[in-house]
């Protein structure tokens, strides 16, 4: 009864030419120990011979005692529960289906595992949180669907091409559930990081570039403002005119409202980017700033201290 065979392993494994593939695998054949194991590449059942045809990458009865360093394909398992495999180096033409042909005293089973080998190292994938706000710590994640004991790799973070100073935490998984390498970087973005390019670079053990993924940071932030005043020293005599201009240097998302404040109190009917004060009086002396809001919140400019002197 072939339903007795139970296998656990990743459904598909990914690698590239010249790297290696480590295939974590467990199995159970309830009728007893495994007598032999054959690893096929792209096996096809031959009805005439009642056997499987295909390239034999490993045969336990032949290869089981060959020194491991001499074998490209290794069965690292045993006769009752472990079916872990290693192919080192792995080649482009190894892509396809691996067939694990298991034979016990009374039963046979063919278990299939998919192998996807690319010509060149495939890029990792950067995962960002759905929203990034300035000054709020976020975790940037770089995920690569690859890990192999015989082929060490590293993931490096770059901001605008410069290595990021924050310490990244790299973890690997080589389990029957998943095979991956992941790097996580905790980062508190400033508004000035908005629009900047973050790169996760895949490198070999020597730091040689293999591939990368890039994302453009979308940092939500309140409007960033600059205030300009004429005259520039903001010292005028009574009866003079003063013009203040508010410039938005950055806003994400777009701004929605503009207002002016004097000594912290909003000036009525002043909702444009220019504040014109004509024939000023002494009591108009004080601290002026503009405030521009967006969905994140209000942003204020620096304060300008207007001094109105007697004529």
């Amino acid at each position: 009864d072939s339903s007795k065979w139970v296998f656990e392993h990743p459904e598909t494994l990914y690698a590239w030419e010249g790297a290696c593939v480590w295939i974590p695998c467990t199995y159970r054949a309830l009728d007893g120990d495994l007598e032999s194991f054959i690893l096929f590449h792209n096996p096809e059942y031959n009805k005439n011979t009642s056997k499987f045809d295909g390239t034999r990458l490993y045969e336990s009865t032949k290869d089981g005692k060959v020194p491991s360093e001499q074998k490209r394909v290794q069965f690292l398992g045993d006769k009752n529960k472990n079916c872990t495999l290693s192919i080192h180096p792995v080649h482009l033409n190894d892509s396809g289906q691996l067939g694990l042909r298991m034979e016990s005293k009374t039963e046979k089973w063919m278990e299939r595992i998919h192998l996807n080998v690319s010509e060149r190292p495939f890029p990792p994938h950067i995962q960002l949180p759905p929203e990034i706000q300035e000054s709020q710590e976020v975790t940037l994640t770089c995920l690569l669907n690859f890990s192999c004991y015989g082929y060490p790799i590293q993931l490096q973070w770059l901001l605008e091409g410069v290595p990021m100073r924050q310490a990244a935490v790299t973890s690997t998984s080589l389990t029957i559930k998943s095979v991956f390498t992941r790097s996580e970087l905790k980062f508190s973005p400033q508004w000035s990081h908005h629009g900047k390019i973050v790169t996760c670079q895949l490198q070999d053990a020597d730091g040689k570039f293999l591939s990368n993924d890039t994302v453009q940071l979308n940092v939500k932030h309140t409007p960033k403002l600059e205030i300009k005043v004429t005259p520039s020293d903001a010292i005028v005599r009574e009866g003079d005119s003063v013009t203040m201009t508010c410039e938005v240097s950055s806003s994400n998302p777009e701004y929605t409202t503009v207002s002016w404040l004097k000594d912290g109190t909003s000036l009525k009917k002043q909702n444009t980017f220019t504040l014109n004060l004509r024939e000023v009086t002494k009591d108009q002396s004080g601290k002026y700033c503009c405030q521009v809001s967006n969905d994140v919140g209000p942003g204020r400019s620096e304060e300008v201290f207007l001094q109105v002197q007697y004529a």
Partner: antibody, heavy 120, light 112 residues
Framework: QVQLQQSGPELVKPGASVKISCKAS????????MNWVKQRPGQGREWIGR????????NYSGKFKGKATLTADKSSSTAYMQLSSLTSVDSAVYFC?????????????WGAGTTVTVSS | DILMTQTPLSLPVSLGDQASISCRSS???????????LEWYLQKPGQSPKLLIY???NRFSGVPDRFSGSGSGTDFTLKISRVEAEDLGVYYC?????????FGGGTKVEIK
């Protein structure tokens, strides 16, 4: 049951060659290594080499490279060993022995031995 | 090549005695897969060898439990707890870990 039937004794002249056989039965011949062992009286035993009948792969002891040639015929489940340029030191009993396990590796079944005598 | 040195060359025993044979390899015979492929064979006059012990200490099927193997690294021992008449013959140790595989010189167990 598993058996290895070896060919009969050989009397050969120095400089000649001899080919001895080992016919397997009771198991899938192509899927076990077949080893060959030399035994001379008072000289202990020497491992000559092995062949995997499934694909013809061989491993030889350095001492027997050029002396012994291992072949196998899957259709008749027979392994062969040819010994060339024979001298008196090649006079011995030659055994074939099967590697009997995927996991533990041991010579679980042996042939009865073939006696080769080199004499003019 | 790995040299397998067996001692003693000859072992006279009385039936019912314990017998012990030593086998020393000239270097470690731990295979790269972690196993130690050290076997013991018994050959009786006019017969082909019979497997007794594999992988240092595992008794082959049908081998009486009076036979036991032990050791590690380069030193190995075969013990027969109570020698019986059918145990007489030449015992060989064998390493199948590294090419070329090699046998010990043999120990002849005979009646005193």
């Amino acid at each position: 049951q598993v058996q290895l039937q070896q060919s009969g004794p050989e009397l050969v002249k120095p400089g000649a060659s001899v080919k001895i056989s080992c016919k397997a039965s009771g198991y899938e011949f192509s899927r076990s290594w077949m080893n060959w062992v030399k035994q001379r009286p008072g000289q202990g035993r020497e491992w000559i080499g092995r062949i995997y009948p499934g694909d013809g792969d061989t491993n030889y002891s350095g001492k027997f490279k050029g002396k012994a040639t291992l072949t196998a015929d899957k259709s008749s489940s027979t392994a062969y060993m040819q010994l060339s340029s024979l001298t008196s030191v090649d006079s011995a009993v030659y055994f074939c022995a099967r590697d009997g396990s995927s996991w533990d590796w041991y010579f679980d079944v042996w042939g009865a031995g073939t006696t080769v005598t080199v004499s003019s | 090549d790995i040299l397998m040195t067996q001692t003693p060359l000859s072992l006279p025993v009385s039936l019912g005695d314990q017998a012990s044979i030593s086998c020393r390899s000239s270097q470690s015979i731990v295979h790269s897969n972690g196993n130690t492929f050290l076997e013991w064979y018994l050959q009786k006059p006019g017969q082909s060898p019979k497997l007794l012990i594999y992988k240092v200490s595992n008794r082959f099927s049908g081998v009486p439990d009076r036979f036991s193997g032990s050791g590690s690294g380069t030193d190995f021992t075969l013990k027969i707890s109570r020698v019986e008449a059918e145990d007489l013959g030449v015992y060989y140790c064998f390493q199948g870990s590294q090419f070329p595989y090699t046998f010990g010189g043999g120990t002849k167990v005979e009646i005193k």
